[in-house]
Amino acid sequence: QAGPLPKPTLWAEPGSVISWGNSVTIWCQGTLEAREYRLDKEESPAPWDRQNPLEPKNKARFSIPSMTEDYAGRYRCYYRSPVGWSQPSDPLELVMTGAYSKPTLSALPSPLVTSGKSVTLLCQSRSPMDTFLLIKERAAHPLLHLRSEHGAQQHQAEFPMSPVTSVHGGTYRCFSSHGFSHYLLSHPSDPLELIVSGSLEDPRPSPTRSVSTAAGPEDQPLMPTGSVPHSGLRRHWE
């Protein structure tokens, strides 16, 4: 007797973080024996979508013409062959940005910092939120979460860095979110350029690459120091 059907591969183009109103295509790739593909969204009351395979039958396309809150979430796909349904794919997390107004990102005391000193990036939202994310451009592991304890709402989160090295230099943005759906993020803050001076080593430009690629040493998440900020937020690493 044959073993379970191999699981399909699930991915999104142009990516899994999509701005409100933009289009996204979800692809599910199975085998040439596939007769039907099914996309399931976590905690949905019914299959999210079902599609016939595209020739040569080894994949299916699920189109989202305009990204809205409805589509943000965690997906898996399956394919059906003559012997039954496959194992589920690994999950795909589809995140929508633009759900809330953009926060403000600033550097204290200044975005120009000397190597070895300390700097704190401050993400502030107009309305109280319970999750803040700091993202460094072109980092393989860009997300640093600060999430409030017990759902307490905050207007800001602090991301301290100490001691600063050339690795910390670069462009940052932050997002805010509500805990009831971490698949819905605010518009991104305006970019903040953190410039590290006085370093003996020349800062190397980080190569442009997608979030899914392996991390190099310059792409490690910022390691915060000291105690949890007074804002009542807890640190979570992605």
């Epitope: 996309l39 019914a46 979430g73 349904w85």
Partner: antibody, heavy 122, light 109 residues
Framework: QVQLVESGGGVVQPGRSLRLSCAAS????????IHWVRQAPGKGLEWVAV????????YYADSVKGRFTISRDNSKNTLYLQMNSLRAEDTAVYYC???????????????WGQGTLVTVSS | DAVVTQESALTTSPGETVTLTCRSS?????????ANWVQEKPDHLFTGLIG???NRVPGVPARFSGSLIGDKAALTITGAQTEDEAIYFC?????????FGGGTKVTVL
Amino acid sequence: QVQLVESGGGVVQPGRSLRLSCAASGFTFSTYGIHWVRQAPGKGLEWVAVIWFDGSNKYYADSVKGRFTISRDNSKNTLYLQMNSLRAEDTAVYYCARDVISMVRGVPFDYWGQGTLVTVSS
Amino acid sequence: DAVVTQESALTTSPGETVTLTCRSSTGAVTTSNYANWVQEKPDHLFTGLIGGINNRVPGVPARFSGSLIGDKAALTITGAQTEDEAIYFCALWYSNHWVFGGGTKVTVL
């Protein structure tokens, strides 16, 4: 046109069993999920259970979990509800209602049957 | 267990706009509750109106629309007709089960 016809209702004593059927026509039964919903005399609607198009997923209301079983036979275009350990509070008109092909295509509870009355009484 | 609450009754006049709401005891109604609206006419004739991902059942007039207003789901009848007199039930999804509200009796005088 879409038709859902329930049958199998009647009077039954507490603790006994009953099996309801829902015969579907006018649409491709095997591509749709189907619900059971009930309405006690003079009351509102209470959702009972749903089964996906291929039977792969089944969900139940807490009030019937462990006592009722939803199933389907796609070759016969028929939905079933096996009701065991019946209680007086299960007395209601039981309706089957069509679910969706998928969430992005269709609306849950779009078509309903006329219902079959189940009375649980000693 | 979640309780879904609706207005017990609303009265409107032909041509007027009426909004029915659906509140969840667990907090704000969100898109993840997939709010659904069902109409009951006399003799227990049930028809789905709106649900899923903002879908309207084919054949349902465009004057019926669903939305989220504040922390509640809403059904708006824009330009009510006498034939819209009925009981309207909302249903909300909670991860693995549906819960119906108690229904709103709409009278069109």
